[in-house]
Every structure is written in C-alpha cells, then in structure tokens.
C-alpha cells in the first residue's frame, strides 16, 4: 500500500436546501484505470461511511441507488455532492481515494471538509 496526497476544501456551508458540493483532488502517481472514492463522516470521534463509488477513468461515478451522494470525475478530480443534509449532519467529511488498478495499490485520505448545515426556517402558515 502506497500513500497518496488528497486535497479538499477545509470548510463548506451547505445550501439552504441541504446540498453540499466539494472537490476531492488526488495526486495520482501513475495511470490508474480504476478508482474508488469513499466519503467518511467524522463526528464526536466516531467515523462512519457516508457513501462510496468505484469508477473507471473517463466514466461517471456510480453510487448505490439509495445513496445521498452523487459525483462526477475529471482527471484527478472528483466533484462530490451530498444531498438531504440537515443541521444534525454537520461534521467533518473526509475523502478517501484508492487507486485499485493497475497495481500498485495507492491510498490517500484528505484532511476533511467541515460541512456546516443549517435547517431552513419553517415556512409560515398561509391561507392558500
């Protein structure tokens, strides 16, 4: 297992609709054809997996159908979008990148993006 540098923004504020996007960029030492990207959430010292996708270079990222994540790739950058976020989901979201094929296997873990989420104000009742 060889180490690889992964960069991501330090702090991001989600939109009022609970959507947060950020770029995860990795310094690929070689010509990987198969890449796995995992988003981990660290909160109160606990780390949980948010979503993961494996993709072939030049192809779209495919997350599971019920995943809260979507993404696109361009070269050594992965643009990740997490939706359905609420205030309780505020936390440090860490990007983990694995170059699966061809060998050697490389692993890189970013420092994390602190995503802040604020629940939208409830709409006032109307007569309509």
């Amino acid at each position: 297992c060889k180490a690889m540098h992964v960069a991501q923004p330090a702090v991001v504020l989600a939109s009022s609709r609970g959507i947060a996007s950020f770029v995860c960029e990795y310094a690929s030492p070689g010509k990987a054809t198969e890449v796995r990207v995992t988003v981990l959430r660290q909160a109160d010292s606990q780390v949980t997996e948010v979503c993961a996708a494996t993709y072939m270079m030049g192809n779209e990222l495919t997350f599971l159908d019920d995943s809260i994540c979507t993404g696109t790739s361009s070269g050594n950058q992965v643009n990740l979008t997490i939706q359905g976020l609420r205030a309780m989901d505020t936390g440090l979201y860490i990007c983990k990148v694995e170059l699966m094929y061809p060998p050697p296997y490389y692993l890189g873990i970013g420092n994390g993006t602190q995503i802040y989420v604020i629940d939208p104000e409830p709409c006032p009742d109307s007569d309509f």
């Epitope: 923004p9 330090a10 702090v11 991001v12 504020l13 989600a14 939109s15 009022s16 996007s21 950020f22 909160a43 109160d44 205030a87 505020t90 440090l92 420092n111 994390g112 602190q114 802040y116 989420v117 604020i118």
Partner: antibody
Framework: QVQLVQSGAEVKKPGASVKVSCKAS????????ISWVRQAPGQGLECMGW????????NYAQKLQGRVTMTTDTSTSTAYMELRSLRSDDTAVYYC??????????WGQGTMVTVSS | EIVMTQSPATLSLSPGERATLSCRAS???????LSWYQQKPGQAPRLLIY???TRATGIPARFSGSGSETDFTLTISSLQPEDFAVYYC?????????FGPGTKVDIK
C-alpha cells in the same frame, strides 16, 4: 504569511450603508470561510455571520437578517461585508476572521465604523 | 442557538499566580469545536486554544485547555505581565457560531 487585511475606518450617518473589505493572502482563499465579528465599544464579541468562500453560501445572525450582506470576490481573494440602514448602535470595530476547522484561526486588524449624525 | 457563559466576569490576580477560567455551554458541544481567544486593548482577538485543548501555533505552554460537553476550562499556569487581557470562549459546533461574554484577567 497568512493574513487578512481590512479596509480603513469609516464615519457614516444614520440610515446610510457601509461596506468593509477584507483581503486574504498566504492561503487558498476558497478552502475556508470568512466570518464577520463586531465589537461595540467596551463590549464583547458578536458574530454577525459568515460566508463560505468555496461556494458563496451565507449564514447571517438573525438580528441582522435583511440588513447585512456578505460576499466574496475569489479573483482577488477578498471578502466584503455590507451593513445597511445604519443606527448609532452599529458603532463598533468590525473584524473579519478566517473560519477554519474548529476555530476562527486568523483575524483581520479590525475596521472602526462610527455612526453619528 | 447555543448560549455560552463565562465565569468569573473579572479575575484579579498577581503575576506568577495560576488563573482558571470557566466556560459553560447551554447544550453539549463536541470538544473539537470549542476554542479560546485572547484580546488585548486595541487589538484583534488571537486564537489561543482550539479543539478544547490544542494550543494554536506560537502559544506558550503555560496556556492549557480542558473540558467536554458543556463545561470547559482555560488555565494559565503562571501569569505573565503580557497575559492580562480579556479571554473569550467560542463554539463553532452549531450555527450560529457564538462567543461567551468574556473574562477579564486584571492585575491585583
């Protein structure tokens, strides 16, 4: 080195607007947020809200909602805070601060805004 | 909104003495998001401690932080003349971010 440099002191009349700038250098501007904090004479620190330089999303203090606008110009690594309909109790030193992971780690030198008729 | 309270409001001590400042949050705050700042007259605040207990770059070892959930403490082991200032705690755990009202450490 990493620093935030703010614009100079302002004197405004009640009802006017003020726009304070905060120029960042020494780091990747879009990787962090910028918060604006004010301090009235002899008082404590009040967080006015912040802007995510990465995407321009903002979160304002409820008491200032509708009067304050925070923006960024990523081409010049500069953040702006505009406060409208100024009142005498808006007289304060206004600071910008970098929002890092878990703290406001870098602060500007402060901008004195005096509201007086 | 998380309300931060600090005690005492003023602490009168002599150089060389130990200072213990308290900060309380109205609801639980992850220690990763609790910080302390020092402010001297006419100057901008300066980050001292983040993550409840980690000293910021260039901060002397006499400053230490501790605590968890709702109760946090800043300790200055031996006050130096330059340490007489106002100290603020802050949470960046939940929006909106909030500061405590401050503790003034002055010379006895």
């Amino acid at each position: 080195q990493v620093q935030l440099v703010q614009s100079g002191a302002e004197v405004k009349k009640p009802g006017a607007s003020v726009k304070v700038s905060c120029k960042a250098s020494g780091y990747t501007f879009t990787s962090y947020g910028i918060s604006w904090v004010r301090q009235a004479p002899g008082q404590g620190l009040e967080c006015m809200g912040w802007i995510s330089a990465y995407n321009g999303n903002t979160n304002y203090a409820q008491k200032l909602q509708g009067r304050v606008t925070m923006t960024t110009d990523t081409s010049t690594s500069t953040a702006y805070m505009e406060l409208r309909s100024l009142r005498s109790d808006d007289t304060a030193v206004y600071y910008c601060a970098r929002v890092g992971i878990g703290a406001f780690d870098i602060w500007g030198q402060g901008t004195m805004v005096t509201v007086s008729s | 909104e998380i309300v931060m309270t600090q005690s005492p409001a003023t602490l009168s001590l002599s150089p060389g003495e130990r200072a213990t400042l308290s900060c309380r949050a109205s609801q639980s705050v992850s220690s990763s998001y609790l910080s302390w700042y020092q402010q001297k007259p006419g100057q901008a605040p300066r980050l001292l401690i983040y993550g409840a207990s980690t000293r910021a770059t260039g901060i002397p070892a006499r400053f230490s932080g501790s605590g968890s959930e709702t109760d946090f403490t800043l300790t200055i082991s031996s006050l130096q003349p330059e340490d007489f200032a106002v100290y603020y705690c802050q949470q960046v755990y939940n929006l909106p971010f909030t500061f405590g009202p401050g503790t003034k450490v002055d010379i006895k």
